[in-house]
Amino acid sequence: MRTEAQVPALQPPEPGLEGAMGHRTLVLPWVLLTLCVTAGTPEVWVQVRMEATELSSFTIRCGFLGSGSISLVTVSWGGPNGAGGTTLAVLHPERGIRQWAPARQARWETQSSISLILEGSGASSPCANTTFCCKFASFPEGSWEACGSLPPSSDPGLSAPPTPAPILRADLAGILGVSGVLLFGCVYLLHLLRRHKHRPAPRLQPSRTSPQAPRARAWAPSQASQAALHVPYATINTSCRPATLDTAHPHGGPSWWASLPTHAAHRPQGPAAWASTPIPARGSFVSVENGLYAQAGERPPHTGPGLTLFPDPRGPRAMEGPLGVR
């Protein structure tokens, strides 16, 4: 599992010797170090929206921000896959889609994003405090999962301001551009470290706000998500999980799976106009495979999802499948 780079809080330098210039040169290496450590890390974003017209209807959208090829997407609710979550849909880019009640329609939006319409009545009906998770098995990165839910205060049908979000796909130009900047940054960091090697090391103290806070992104679009507090997964309110779960089976798989034919998409569509899809403010979760999550704060307009993602420590498809049955 990749180590998380924490950006420690720096004590202000002694007045005089370096002054403002000294402060800048002390902070910059840490920012660049974070940039180097987090370079090329794939991410998963999750958007959950309740339809204004049908209060029991949800739309879950998930996307993968990475250069790899997606080999499987698993959407679950009630927690991450293999950690008590119940599979709602599995999408394979070549073989098609499998979905189970209360999922109504799962489909590929682009080659790296999917959507799932969920509806139900009675026991299998989702509600506002249900947590939905998306797990992307990608080649060659491995498995990445993120979770999201509507906060209790959300109004039905509410979404982020209709401002265009950046295109949610890592194209070649972007990769090359970022790679160049990162390479320059890393070289510059080495240069700075060499310059400072004879100077006394600055006194560092750990951040008081949250010892487990996700690492700060160098280009962090959401400050709130950087300082998000991690709490145990057990605190998630899953009172709206279906009461008819097949508890006789350890994987928690439902015994009421859909018996109607699924959406017959056998290949993802080409990249659609996802740039115009508004990403809702709030209601996003950052998921950690070991059972931690954090609610990401409101993000400013004109920014794409900036969720911090943690890789599956057990590698791709570690549970041998979405239900973790063996």
Partner: antibody, heavy 117, light 107 residues
């Protein structure tokens, strides 16, 4: 214990029909794709057909139009209706479980189908 | 259809030997590949899934590697019970296809 038990094999004349059954136990049957795989004596394995959780079906080209895969989730049962049988269909037929997208993990012991005059 | 070319078709080895079997796909299949062991008169048993993940209960001397079009099954130290026929299977697209098999015999 997860188990798949095939039945229905036997000797049949070319052009005849046979219906194979597979009884599943020890897991939630409706959660899985189910497959039929065959193996002629002394030969390699050959995939025959797949049925998804909601009834989506897929076939090997050489059996399309002759074989029909079906499932009865309430009975934890998988079937393969084989019509217009040919000598080339002679093989041991295995019932196999697959968690969609993750490959075949559990196999039955097989049932033998012999097509001969 | 995706063709799976498995080599060698047979090999002779001794207990303790390191054995390598390869499978080549006619087109990219990401990591949608499994390795199976079959003994005479028995059903196949899965050893490796997702190209490189060890099936629960399978000894760690078995390992898988590769992705895309080239895949390898390695037995680090051959044991008497490992003499069998090994198959690769691609489940990336329909129809699923198996490699032709590799029979591992006692030298």
């Amino acid at each position: 214990e997860v188990q798949l038990v095939e039945s229905g094999g036997g000797l049949v004349q070319p052009g005849g029909s046979l219906r194979l059954s597979c009884a599943a136990s020890g897991f939630t049957f409706s959660n899985y794709d189910m497959h039929w795989v065959r193996q002629a004596t002394g030969k390699g394995l050959e995939w025959v057909s797949d049925i998804g959780n909601a009834g989506e079906t897929y076939y090997l080209d050489s059996v399309k139009g002759r074989f029909t895969i079906s499932r009865e989730n309430a009975k934890n049962s998988l079937y393969l209706q084989m019509n217009s049988l040919r000598a080339g269909d002679t093989a041991v037929y295995y019932c196999v479980r697959e968690e969609f997208g993750h490959g075949m993990d559990v196999w039955g012991q097989g049932t033998t189908v012999t097509v001969s005059s | 259809d995706i063709q799976m070319t498995q080599s060698p078709s047979s090999l002779s080895a001794s207990v303790g030997d390191r054995v390598t079997i390869t499978c080549r796909a006619s087109q990219g299949i990401r990591s949608d590949l499994g390795w199976y062991q079959q003994k005479p008169g028995k059903a196949p048993k899965r050893l490796i899934y997702a190209a490189s993940s060890l099936q629960s209960g399978v000894p760690s001397r078995f390992s898988g590697s590769g992705s895309g079009t080239e895949f390898t099954l390695t037995i680090s130290s051959l044991q008497p019970e490992d003499f069998a026929t090994y198959y690769c299977l691609q489940h990336n697209s329909y129809p699923f296809t198996f490699g032709g098999g590799t029979k591992v015999e006692i030298k």
